[in-house]
């Protein structure tokens, strides 16, 4: 998956950021999990949407809205529930 961060500049502890995790052309619909740098699940303020294309493959976008701490690592894990395959990506904000 790919990740984007907004705002992505001039950040301070206390800022609210939006982290978007995107994965494309999967089948079937994926499961998305978020966790912090210690592996603690992040379940609040998560919005996940999935959309099928003409081929019936799914694009997934999951948005985590989080208040930054002093240092933070945020990871998203995209799981194929049938194949039990995981793909993950993370961003560290210092």
């Amino acid at each position: 998956p790919s990740m984007t961060l907004e705002p992505n500049k001039d950040l301070r502890p206390g800022d609210t950021v939006t982290i978007t995790c995107s994965s494309y052309q999967g089948y079937p619909e994926a499961e998305v999990f978020w966790q912090d740098g210690q592996g603690v699940p992040l379940t609040g303020n998560v919005t996940t949407s999935q959309m099928a294309n003409e081929q019936g493959l799914f694009d997934v976008h999951s948005i985590l809205r989080v208040v930054l701490g002093a240092n933070g690592t945020y990871s998203c894990l995209v799981r194929n529930p049938v194949l039990q395959q995981d793909a993950h990506s993370s961003v560290t904000i210092t």
Epitope: E6, P7, D10, R12, D15, T16, V17
Partner: antibody, heavy 122, light 107 residues
């Protein structure tokens, strides 16, 4: 060229609210922070808060948390600050400013609006 | 909150003199300090960012220095158009804060 144009003079009654505007042009509105700063007559500058219009991320100086509400309208590239429950001590000039990347990884308030004078009086 | 203390409150200088303005932070702010010039009835203008970097178009007579808690703005040879208030501000941590300003008058 980057410009920030603020709304005109406001004369308001105690207890009322006022909404100030800051119309921007000449840069990508959603990609930089907008700051709001208060200056009472003959005084220094006081930071109220800032908003990142791209995702409506805001941070307020605790002192102004119950006083100011920052919003942004992407379609018109305009930032707004609403001031509530106005008192005489809210009489001041209010500036908006862009938090620009003046050099790679260096940020500062590089462009300022002309200021809006707010007078609270009965 | 980090307190930024500027001194002196005001000063009166003759044309061509060297001017030194001080700004002290109540705790370490690294080099996250900017200086702003505000002429009468105008909005502030950025002079110095990152404690020592002159902003585009700012005359070379303006120099910023310092780090951690002690910062200085120097005008090497003051000109008539330098009549203004000078504000230092930190953006190291929330809430961002400014000093109370130094008013520069010309004799």
């Amino acid at each position: 060229q980057v410009q920030l144009k603020q709304s005109g003079i406001e004369l308001v009654r105690p207890g009322a609210s006022v909404k100030l505007s800051c119309k921007t042009s000449g840069y990508i509105f959603t990609a930089d922070w907008i700051y709001w700063v208060k200056q009472r007559s003959g005084q220094g500058l006081e930071w109220i808060g800032r908003i990142y219009p791209g995702v409506d991320s805001t941070y307020y100086n605790e002192k102004f948390k119950d006083k100011a509400i920052l919003t942004a309208d992407k379609s018109s590239s305009t930032a707004y600050m609403q001031l509530n429950s106005l008192k005489s001590e809210d009489s001041a000039v209010y500036f908006c400013a862009r938090g620009g990347e003046v050099r790679r990884d260096f940020y500062a308030l590089d462009y300022w609006g002309q200021g809006t004078s707010v007078t609270v009086s009965s | 909150n980090i307190v930024m203390t500027q001194s002196p409150e005001s000063m009166s200088m003759s044309l061509g003199e060297r001017v030194t303005l001080s700004c002290k932070a109540s705790e370490n702010v690294g080099t996250y300090v900017s200086w702003y010039q505000q002429k009468p009835e105008q909005s502030p203008k950025l002079l110095i960012y990152g404690a020592s970097n002159r902003y585009t178009g700012v005359p070379a007579r303006f120099t910023g220095s310092g780090s951690a808690t002690d910062f200085t703005l120097t005008i090497s040879s003051v000109q008539a158009e330098d009549l203004a208030d000078y504000h230092c501000g930190q953006r190291y941590s929330y809430p961002f804060t400014f000093g109370s300003g130094t008013k520069l008058e010309i004799k």
